[in-house]
């Protein structure tokens, strides 16, 4: 009987131990994982993170559709509805050229560097070739009668503009457009002035920078959030809080991201701080990661949002701050008439659409989203959509807007930048992140259900025993 | 070097007419545009008249509409200002001027212009 | 027409001081304000432009502060070259218009 009983005794023991170990395994795993983490996210050399920071391992697409107008006679003769039509994807591989000037400063734990900019193009993934032609405004007819609109200097314009035979709309070629053009009308300005024109010029062979961020090293819930920006903690656009530079630049956030998190990131093209708030749960080839969107609440009037009041800059085209759904960053593009959207003016206030037709804005398209892995941190794969537009206003002494009777906020284009972890970084993250901690998760539950159910049953088994043995 | 010269100043009767000259150097009238400002004797500067970039439109005070008009030639990079029927109260030194921006950067030396019996 | 008023009509001041000439827009000129320096049989000579840009080779004791409808020169150390009349002229609207000029004298 006593082997028996000692032999029970010993399996619910052993059950016992197993379950203890299981149970006291998963803190301890919990704080083995969050060490192996912390150590790993760290920006310097010789983490993962660092690796992957450096040089991004995914390839970043960046899609644009043009805003090609069908009917400019019509909007400069008659100030008629400009009607569009989109054309693309025309894509360009960029975001494929390592940080530069990386140095880190021990002192305050910050690592500061310049993001090389480069846009290669991709035929392949996109309908036509940069050699395609669009009628869009005329980019710098518009500029210039925004920047100068003293009626003397536009009398002087207008001179120029007929001169060079300008008109408010022109035909660009699709590189002339996005990387720039030397423009007639502001090559006959007799100053240095630069004539060059372009959405995006100059950028091949620019930087955005420089970026300070902290390294991690003294706190992990700091690690890439920026501390400093060209210098500075603030961007001298807006006015109070609007004008900081708040979190991360969405590459990755600080680790073990909850969904209650606002997660904060800054944007050098829209020359704002901005958040996103979780939506849902996505499995990205076999990664658990946290769906963040930018809400349309981003993007709402000081009316509906009291938050957003130190983005509305002026009161005239905003209707005295009532309009919504577009960001006019002047002050950060040399004063001219920039203004950001959501693709299609998604979120937008119906009085920003009125004047544009053949506009079809959908989420599912035209909405903005960061897929994050929760444990790291890192952004595993984004959609950044936005829209670039320029305000043309009538000017009774130049002779292309003369006719116009009201204000036009012009779609030029939206671009969709897109990035997923490759398939081998995906299987790599999974066997060295995901697999790790579904492992030893796997290991503490087998342990835990083990040891309960052969305690249980062994105690079961030997009391069973004694009853009889009593009897 | 930018230099403005002007002539054709002198002594004139009422309702008699006379053509200024400025002749510019250093750089083309036609880009930049040219302005007459004249200062009566111990007074003022009072703007005139001027001609906007490429030959484009041109302007006048007030005080000489339909009587002044000024006019350039691009292949001598001269600017005129003819001025018909002329007052006593024309009597001034007129200069040249030239600007982009509304402001005269350079100016030529005058020229006295006197409308008197 | 934009009328522009200036004070004081003339001023006297010794050298090494300093000095403020005002200039009154009838109506908004935002930045597009000039000041002339002109001396007695010489053609004026452009000092500043938008209110506040000195023109290169103007020495950088001569500022100009304002927008809207109030603008300053000022001259912070007065020099002898510096006797002279100052006039602002508004270049935001045609017809272009002048102050009736201030003159700087020696005390």
């Known amino acids: 009987g006593c082997d028996r009983n000692c032999g029970l005794i010993t399996g619910a023991v052993i059950g016992a131990v197993l379950a203890v170990f299981g149970g006291i395994l998963m803190p301890v795993g919990d704080m083995l994982i969050q060490k192996t983490i912390k150590k790993e996210v760290v920006l310097e050399e010789g983490t993962i993170a660092f690796k992957n920071w450096v040089k991004t391992g995914t390839e970043i697409y960046r899609q644009f559709w043009i805003f090609d107008v069908q009917n400019p006679q019509e909007v400069m003769m008659n100030s008629s509805n400009i009607q569009v039509k989109q054309r693309g994807p025309y894509t360009y591989r960029v975001r494929f050229l390592a940080k530069e000037n990386i140095t880190q400063d021990p002192k305050d734990n910050t690592v500061s560097f310049l993001q090389p900019n480069g846009a290669i193009f991709e035929p392949s993934l996109s309908v036509g070739t940069e050699a395609d032609n669009f009628t869009v405004l005329n980019l710098a007819v518009a500029a210039a009668s925004h920047i100068y609109p003293n009626p003397f200097v536009q009398v002087v314009l207008n001179s120029l503009i007929n001169k060079s035979k300008s008109s408010m709309f022109q035909v660009r070629t699709l590189r002339e457009l996005l990387w720039g053009y030397t423009d007639p009308f502001l090559s006959l300005v007799p100053y240095p002035v630069s004539t060059r024109v372009g959405m995006f010029y100059p950028y091949n062979n620019t930087a955005d920078g420089v970026y300070k961020v902290f390294n991690g090293k003294d706190s992990i819930s700091k690690v890439a959030i920026i501390d400093t920006y060209k210098g500075k903690r603030n961007l001298s656009y807006w006015e109070s809080y609007c004008d900081m530079i708040n979190g991360t630049d969405a590459a990755s956030f600080p680790p073990f991201v909850e969904k209650s998190q606002v997660l904060q990131f800054f944007s050098s093209d829209i020359c704002r701080s901005i958040y996103a708030v979780f939506e849902s749960d996505v499995n990205l080839k076999g990664i658990p990661v946290y769906r963040f969107v930018l809400p349309s609440k981003a993007f709402a009037s000081p009316v509906q949002n009291p938050d957003n009041h130190c983005f509305c800059t002026e009161k005239i085209i905003s209707k005295n701050c009532t309009s919504y759904g577009v960001l006019d960053i002047s002050k950060c593009k040399e004063g001219k008439p920039v203004y950001i959207s959501l693709p299609h003016f998604l979120y937008a206030s119906p009085d920003v659409s009125e004047t544009i037709d053949g506009l079809n804005p959908n989420e599912e398209e035209h909405r903005t989203y960061l897929d994050i892995e929760p444990i790291t941190g890192f952004t595993l794969q984004f959609a950044k959509r936005l829209q670039v537009n320029l305000l043309v206003k009538p000017s009774n002494k130049i002779q292309v807007l003369k006719r116009l009777k009201r204000n036009y906020i012009v779609p030029i284009l939206w671009l969709n930048e897109t990035g997923t972890i490759g398939d081998e970084k995906a299987k790599m993250f999974r066997s060295q992140v995901t697999g790790k901690i579904n492992l030893l998760g796997l290991i503490e539950m087998i342990l835990l259900s083990v040891g309960v159910v052969m305690f249980v049953a062994f105690m079961i088994s030997y009391c069973a025993c004694r009853s009889k043995t009593i009897k | 070097e930018v230099q403005l010269v002007e002539s054709g100043g002198g002594l004139v009767q009422p309702g008699g007419s006379l053509r200024l000259s400025c002749a510019a150097s250093?750089?083309?009238?036609?880009?930049?545009?040219i302005h007459w400002v004249r200062q009566a004797p111990g007074k003022g500067l009072e703007w005139v008249a001027w001609?906007?970039?490429?030959?484009?439109?041109?302007y006048y005070a007030d005080s000489v509409k339909g009587r002044f008009t000024i006019s350039a030639d691009t292949s001598k990079n001269t600017a005129y200002l003819q001025m018909n029927s002329l007052r006593a109260e024309d009597t001034a030194v007129y200069y040249c001027?030239?600007?982009?921006?509304?402001?005269?950067?350079?100016w030529g030396q005058g020229t006295l212009v006197t409308v008197s019996s | 027409d934009i009328q522009m008023t200036q004070s004081p009509s003339s001023l006297s001041a010794s050298v090494g001081d300093r000095v403020t000439i005002t200039c009154r827009a009838s109506?908004?000129?935002?930045?597009?304000v000039a000041w002339y320096q002109q001396k007695p049989g010489k053609a004026p000579k452009l000092l500043i432009s938008?209110?506040?840009s000195l023109y290169s080779g103007v020495p950088s004791r001569f500022s100009g502060s304002g927008s809207g409808t109030d603008f300053t020169l000022t001259i912070s150390s007065l020099q002898p070259e510096d006797f002279a009349t100052y006039y602002c002229?508004?270049?935001?609207?045609?017809?272009?218009?002048f102050g009736q000029g201030t003159k700087v004298e020696i005390k």
């Open positions: 001027a030239r600007s982009f921006f509304g402001y005269f950067d350079y």
């Open positions: 250093g750089f083309t009238i036609s880009s930049f545009g």
């Open positions: 001609i906007a970039p490429y030959g484009g439109d041109t």
């Open positions: 109506q908004d000129v935002s930045n597009w």
């Open positions: 938008y209110a506040t």
């Open positions: 002229q508004q270049h935001s609207n045609a017809p272009l218009t």
